[in-house]
């Protein structure tokens, strides 16, 4: 039996059941290479809680249709009193990239997955010449997914100081120049994901071969190599290669341009600081808000929901679009389609399509862009389910009581794009919210003490109480988690204070609440640190005392007590001095 989706065959894919701490390895054409699951396992389940492996799908017992792949096993299971066999079921939907298998749910007997992928489309319009898996799971089973960076047409320009050359890249996929009417990019050879343009000539300096790799929890690496035989004459006999390192920044920030960091004998090293390299839970929510510990921001679009059957209307030339975001109110036109975005043809209002459903919603804030995506709408002829992408812009003076209104900007291959200026898209970053204090008309701002990213370093507290042999290092950041650099590299990711000694590192508290003015000083309390026994968590208080002109002095450890559950630091710094009188 021929492989149903040949493009997906070259790789072993991963999916995760986060709730149950289970990692699945999937090979849809052959078998996964995991001894514990046996020689013919196509779907191998690794339960990290019990440290056990089970084959939940056998490559030999495969059955396939255009949109469903089932792998049975010979293992019995009990489902509602009847004797079944354990199996895995993968539902395929048309997508614009190779995509990723997503775990849906599991019963006693069946493990369900869903996969939106170009391999499942009725037409080849989204298929790449070369594409590789574009996601990884870290050791905590959190997904890092670069699929949103993949360009279906065009490329990214790499920032390089050389005025005579331009290096263009795509992510995980070759560069498609067919939509390009006539720039330098048009000359790039097919299949290249890294194209070097010198003068009027374009050279393939790398094609995707292997999928994305995780090198550290905040660093992902993608390698491109030139497949073609024959050396380029300007490469001194070496084969060209490109390495792109995607770096998750240590704080929220605007996106940056990919930068060339090294170039030698046609070996190009690129670094790209982008929040897409961070784990997906940091960037996305299935609701209409992003907030709390996980995301470092406070965004709430729920006030944009329309009630009482009304919806926003956006004019799209031939079509009208009816939108109701962040709610489950049925749009009247849309015939019980559960649509969040509904497309109605002006010349024939009986032609109605769901352009995205309200239960298929993703809110994403990454690299400074706030986007609401509705997918799973009615199918187009390619098999792709219509989807809508709403790009939000902050506008504090938006009409309609600050709500503003969505504007249709165009359609590309059954994806509908809108922009929406609204005051509800004005993102409050946690630092902005919480890194100051007021006392009547007096204002205090601790942001001068915040350490943002390497090459900056954490503050290290002075502790005179210990001998060199039992020395503990105390690393502190203000209104921000500690940077994982130097001796603090192993610190827990969300710790704002971290103790490091020969036994390892400890979270002494997270940044959860604002600084407070107390007894003439500023008090900063970090809580919810590591467990310290009796169901308690470590807590740290930092007292900041005004010392004009001094932004260099380090904090000092004053006390630690309550059986290691409480730490107190004192910090004499100009940042604790009154800033100015507030207006009004």
């Amino acid at each position: 039996q021929a492989a149903p989706f040949p493009e997906l065959c070259s790789y072993t894919w991963e999916a995760v059941d986060t709730k149950n701490n289970v990692l699945y390895k999937i090979n849809i054409c052959g078998s996964v290479d995991i001894v514990q699951c046996g020689p013919s396992s196509a779907v191998c389940m690794h339960d990290l809680k019990t440290r056990t492996y089970h084959s939940v799908g056998d490559s030999v017992l495969r059955s396939a249709t255009r949109s469903l792949l089932e792998f049975n096993t010979t293992v019995s299971c009990d489902q509602q009193g009847t004797n079944h066999r354990v199996q895995s079921s993968i539902a395929f939907l048309c997508g614009k990239t190779l995509g990723t298998p997503e775990f849906v749910t599991a019963t006693e007997c069946v493990h369900y997955f869903e996969w939106r992928t170009t391999a499942a489309c009725k037409k080849d319009i989204f298929k790449a010449n070369k594409e590789v898996p574009c996601y990884v799971f870290d050791e905590e089973l959190r997904k890092h997914d670069l699929n949103p960076l993949i360009k279906l047409s065009g490329a990214y320009l790499v920032d390089d100081s050389d005025p005579d050359t331009s290096l263009f890249i795509n992510v995980c996929r070759d560069i498609d120049t067919l939509r390009d009417p006539g720039s330098q990019l048009r000359a790039c050879p097919p299949g290249t994901a890294a194209c070097l343009v010198r003068g009027h000539q374009a050279f393939d300096v790398g094609q995707p071969r292997d999928g994305l790799k995780l090198v550290r929890k905040d660093r992902l690496v993608l390698s491109y190599v030139r497949e073609e035989a024959g050396k380029l004459d300007f490469c001194d006999g070496h084969s060209p290669a490109v390495t792109i390192t995607f770096v998750c920044p240590s704080e929220r920030r605007e996106g940056t341009i990919p930068k060339l960091t090294a170039k030698s004998n046609c070996r190009y090293e690129i670094e790209w600081i982008t929040e897409y390299a961070c784990h997906r839970d940091y960037l996305e929510s299935k609701t209409c808000s992003l907030s709390g510990e996980q995301q470092d921001v406070s965004i709430d679009l729920t006030p944009l929901a329309q009630s009482g059957g009304s919806s926003y209307i956006s004019d799209g030339k031939e079509y009208l679009f009816y939108l109701n975001v962040c709610g489950e109110t049925e749009i009247q036109f849309c015939n019980k389609k559960q649509a969040a975005v509904c497309q109605v043809k002006k010349s024939d209002t009986s032609q109605v399509k769901a352009a995205g459903r309200y239960h298929n919603q993703t809110l994403r804030y990454s690299d400074g862009d706030l986007t609401l995506i509705y997918f799973g709408g009615d199918e187009c002829s390619s098999g792709f389910q219509r989807m809508s992408v709403i790009n939000f812009e902050c506008n504090k003076t938006a009409g309609n009581d600050g709500k503003g209104t969505p504007v249709f900007t165009g359609e590309v291959d059954c994806t509908y794009f809108f922009t929406w200026d609204t005051e509800y898209a004005c993102v409050k970053e946690k630092e902005d919210l919480l890194c100051g204090a007021t006392d009547g008309k007096k204002r205090y701002d601790l942001s001068a003490l915040v350490r943002h990213a390497e090459p900056e370093q954490n503050w290290e507290a002075v502790d005179g109480s210990q001998t060199e042999t039992e020395k503990k290092h105390f690393f502190i950041n203000i209104c921000h988690r500690v940077l994982q650099e130097g001796k603090a590299r192993g610190c827990p990711e969300d710790a704002a204070v971290c103790a490091v000694d020969k036994n390892g590192s400890k979270n002494l508290g997270k940044f959860i609440s604002s600084p407070m003015k107390e007894k003439g000083n500023i008090q900063l309390s970090y809580s919810d640190g590591d467990d310290c026994g009796h169901g308690k968590k470590i807590k740290t208080n930092i007292t900041l005392v005004c010392k004009p002109g001094d932004l260099e002095s380090a904090p000092v450890l004053r006390t630690s007590g309550e059986g290691g559950c409480f730490y107190e630091f004192e910090w004499h710094t100009a940042a604790a001095c009154v800033l100015s009188k507030t207006e009004g």
Partner: nanobody, 123 residues
Framework: DVQLVESGGGLVQPGGSLRLSCAAS????????WGWFRQAPGKEREFVAA????????SYADSVKGRFTISRDNAKNTIYLQMNSLRPEDTAVYYC????????????????WGQGTLVTVSS
Amino acid sequence: DVQLVESGGGLVQPGGSLRLSCAASGRTFNTYNWGWFRQAPGKEREFVAAIRWSSSKTSYADSVKGRFTISRDNAKNTIYLQMNSLRPEDTAVYYCAASIVDFTTNPSHFGSWGQGTLVTVSS
């Protein structure tokens, strides 16, 4: 392909303002990044300002920062360049262009061009 038509150029005194428009038609508006460039007599074409298609992120040449503002009206498929505090050295033919390359300000990465509109700053 995208067709681009610029308008709004003219003669203006130093310190004055002009607003250039660029109407786009043809292939889908929102897959492109948009730029304004200018070419003074006897000089190379130079970058003025750009706006990314997927958001309203903008970039400007140092010489126009704080004076010029690029914007777009997606509903009208139109790009604008608001030019304030104009100087004689801003005299040039201004071109609107489209590119499928992200993060670029290089004119050779822009594949679609308008025919240009002349801006003259003189007293």
